[in-house]
């Protein structure tokens, strides 16, 4: 071999050990969600930052992970801050900045009091009440803890109240106090004024535990204008499109993954269809349809039956004389007997049977059972976010599902249309036999994100009983990124827009709230919120 | 009580490197800066860096860069300065003091360690 | 940079008497002032944080005032044990800076 040709091959050797590469091809269909995983960091020393580009171009996002079961949404509201399943731990002050972590410009972000853990954190001893003043019943057995400028301060209650100021959520819309294991939401100040572009840090200030190592993020000019999720080493883009087709790299340390994105564009009806819930109208429609023609199909069958009925009794009869007669030709019964009515044919009902359980199987096929994760894991819709007003409480935030068409999404039911067009099994070829057409596209999910029966609709959280419950499973990003938010951004504000729900002091599940919350998803242009009084849209916290 | 207890005094030859360590005690180790000041016989103290033991994020003095490496060990609460290429002038008493919070603005110091002496002689 | 000024450099002073330290930065740290007192062969000790905040532990006797760039720490009433250099901190931004020192001695 000669020299140059063995240099060279001892260079690229070199630097493949320096940096090793790991190539990804992943394959999908336009609307899906991209889950582009980063190599593992080296197990002993700190994590590694991590920093995503695209194609040619430079960085477009650089990360510092922190802690597991922690994550970053990038979206219209801002650079928001997830926690999953919070425990006592993670209780405490969240200060951040928009600036990189070296610098000093910390400003405070919100107090996290974790119901039943003893503490209560509270940015000013004026939302504690006055001197010696308790918060209801938690504080009684809570120790308090407010911010001292520059450090916690542990607050004396003294044995004298002047003036109780109620409940827990009576305090600073930068306080929250939520139950264990829910999933919390915060911003870099009060959205919309909240840090939307980067560089934005976070920091966890706990006076008596170890403080959690939270993420800084920084969004660079290259970044995309569109909503990223990042879990760890996982960065999610929901409902791609073609624009984000392309190569992505991430660098972590000296190790580096290559991710190539191909994206299958769908045709022009799946847009529309997609398009801000524009699929309602016409699944609400097909629905009603589908109830009227499966009631006209069950009167004419019936009453179809009873002639049918009747004339045979009436064949039958021994007193009624039969004759021969010669059939007309056309169309008619090929009957030899006069009075004789014509039967369906075996295959005639079901080519339509199967267009019309196709097109409500569409619909509702892929959602499978919703409601299954949410039941078992209790209200995992609800909101914990502080302070709203009485008229919020009136819940106008969860409608009711108003019409049978409505509640199908979100009951598990079987399948309506099925029920209604076979029960009559005879006049049908195959009445067991699943119809099979377009739901076999799973036309109205997003790729697999409904594959499994039990997952769950509402993002950024799946499997809702491993990883919100307070006794679930360990979160692990590389498990769950796969069916995070799989609703489009426009559905997530129905999450993040919607009225401030007061959850109860007391835990315990609350299913048709639940429901109602899966409905609000699909409204994006609903109210925006409004900032100023509650001022909690930056945090949203589920049970 | 806080306690922050330094290593013994250090007698090293020009060019040679040392390693001093801050033992810390009386609180959660991860949760506060650890800063280290030098302070040459006779003059005023001067700002090294400090180290975050939580994320082993770390901020040095332009003047130090090159010269002094922060490290820390969770395990042990301990936290280290090393300087290498020694001069004479690098002789001095070396303070580590406990810092803030990562995160807060807290910029003073409470708690300080009793100092390490090195001398720089051939 | 900011630099962090002092003066006098020394100051001796009688038991009793009311003495008033000054500190000037080079561009204005808010209340980001933090006073130190060293005696001999000591590690420093924290007098006042943030300009003027008291310590627990520390005598009443000594104060802190100013914003911006100039700072002064006074001591109402001397104390033979009040013998020392006393440093003023930056703690606006990094690098933190100390000032020269002013050394307090008893007449």
């Known amino acids: 071999m000669p020299p140059p040709l063995l240099l060279a091959f001892l260079l690229f050797l070199t630097l493949g050990r320096v940096r090793p590469q790991k190539l990804l091809q992943v394959e999908m269909e336009e609307g899906s969600d991209a889950v582009l995983p980063c190599l593992q960091d080296p197990p002993d020393g700190p994590p590694e930052r991590l920093i995503w580009s695209r194609d040619s171009q430079g960085p477009f996002l650089e990360l510092s992970p922190g802690s597991p079961g922690l994550g970053i949404h990038v979206g219209r509201l801002g650079i928001l801050l997830l926690i999953f399943n919070v425990s006592n731990e993670m209780g405490g002050f969240y200060l951040c900045q928009p600036a990189p972590p070296s610098q000093q410009a910390w400003q405070p972000g919100w107090t996290v009091s974790v119901e039943g853990s003893g503490e209560l954190f509270r940015w000013n001893a004026s939302d504690l009440g006055g001197p010696g003043c308790g918060l209801g019943n938690e504080s009684s057995s809570s120790q308090p803890y407010v911010w001292d400028r520059d450090h916690p301060k542990e607050w004396d209650m003294g044995p004298a109240c002047a003036s109780p100021r109620g409940d827990l959520n009576q305090s600073s819309s930068l306080d929250l106090t939520v139950a264990p294991g829910s999933t919390v939401w915060l911003s870099c100040g009060v959205p919309p004024a909240s840090v939307a572009t980067g560089p934005v840090s976070w920091a966890h200030i706990h006076p008596t535990k170890p403080n959690i190592l939270l993420p800084s993020l920084n969004l660079t000019a290259e970044s995309p204008a569109r909503e990223m999720w990042v879990l760890g080493p996982v960065l999610m883009l929901p409902q791609v499109t073609a624009v984000d087709a392309g190569m992505y790299v991430c660098r972590r340390g000296n190790l580096t993954t290559e991710i190539h994105v191909t994206i299958t564009v769908r045709p022009a009806i799946w847009h529309w269809l997609q398009r801000k819930s524009g699929w309602i109208v016409p699944v609400v429609a097909l629905l009603y349809l589908i109830f009227c023609l499966g009631c006209l199909v069950s009167f004419l069958h019936l009453r179809r039956a009873l002639i049918l009925r009747r004339k045979r009794k009436r064949m039958t009869d021994p007193t009624r004389r039969f004759f021969k007669v010669t059939p007309p030709a056309g169309n008619g019964a090929q009957s030899q007997y006069g009075n004789v009515l014509s039967l369906p044919t075996p295959t005639s009902g079901t080519g339509r049977a199967q267009r019309w359980a196709a097109s409500l199987g569409g619909a509702a096929a892929p959602y499978g059972h919703p409601l299954s994760d949410v039941q078992e894991a209790g209200a995992a819709g609800s909101r914990s976010l502080p302070r709203a007003s009485p008229e919020e409480e009136e819940g106008e935030a969860y409608e009711e599902p108003d019409s049978e068409a409505d509640s199908e999404f979100y009951e598990n039911d079987s399948n309506p249309a099925q029920d209604q067009l076979s029960q009559d099994g005879s006049g049908y070829e195959n009445p067991e036999e699943e119809p099979s057409g377009p739901e076999d596209d799973d036309s109205f999910s997003n790729a697999e994100s409904y594959e499994n029966e039990d997952e769950e609709l509402a993002p950024p959280v799946t499997r809702t009983a491993d990883f919100l419950s307070p006794h679930g499973s360990a979160w692990d990003p590389s498990r769950e990124a796969v069916s995070l938010g799989s609703q489009s951004y426009e559905d997530m504000r129905g999450i993040l827009y919607a009225a401030p729900q007061l959850r109860s002091s007391r835990p315990g599940p609350s299913y048709e709230e639940d429901a109602d919350s899966y409905e609000n998803m699909d409204n994006p242009d609903g109210p925006e919120p409004a900032w100023g009084a509650g001022g909690h849209g930056g945090t949203w916290s589920t049970r | 009580q806080v306690q922050l207890q330094q290593s013994g005094p250090e007698v090293v030859k020009p060019g040679a490197s040392v390693r001093m360590s801050c033992k810390a005690s009386?609180?959660?180790?991860?949760?506060?800066?650890i800063h280290w000041m030098k302070q040459r016989p006779g003059q005023g103290l001067e700002w090294v860096g400090c180290?975050?033991?939580?994320?082993?994020?770390?901020n040095y003095n332009e003047k130090f860069k090159g010269k002094a490496t922060l490290t820390a060990d969770k395990s042990s609460s301990t936290a280290y300065l090393q300087l290498s290429s020694l001069t004479s002038e690098d002789s001095a008493v070396y303070f580590c003091?406990?810092?803030?919070?990562?995160?807060?603005?807290?910029?003073?110091?409470?708690?300080w360690g009793q100092g390490t002496l090195v001398i720089v002689s051939a | 940079d900011i630099v962090m000024t002092q003066s006098p450099a020394t100051l001796s002073v009688t038991p009793g008497d009311r003495v008033s330290l000054s500190c000037r930065a080079s561009?204005?740290?808010?209340?980001?002032l933090h006073w130190y007192q060293q005696s001999s062969h000591e590690s420093p000790r924290l007098l006042i944080k943030?300009?003027?905040q008291s310590i627990s532990g520390i005598p009443s006797r000594f104060s802190g005032s100013g914003s911006g760039s100039d700072f002064t720490l006074t001591i109402n009433s001397v104390e033979p044990e009040d013998v020392g250099v006393y440093y003023c901190q930056n703690g606006h931004s990094f690098p933190y800076t100390f000032g020269g020192g002013t050394n307090l001695e008893i007449k």
């Open positions: 561009q204005s740290i808010s209340d980001f």
């Open positions: 180290i975050y033991p939580g994320n082993v994020n770390s």
């Open positions: 943030y300009a003027s």
């Open positions: 003091a406990r810092g803030g919070y990562y995160g807060s603005s807290y910029s003073w110091f409470a708690y």
């Open positions: 009386g609180y959660i180790f991860t949760n506060h800066y």
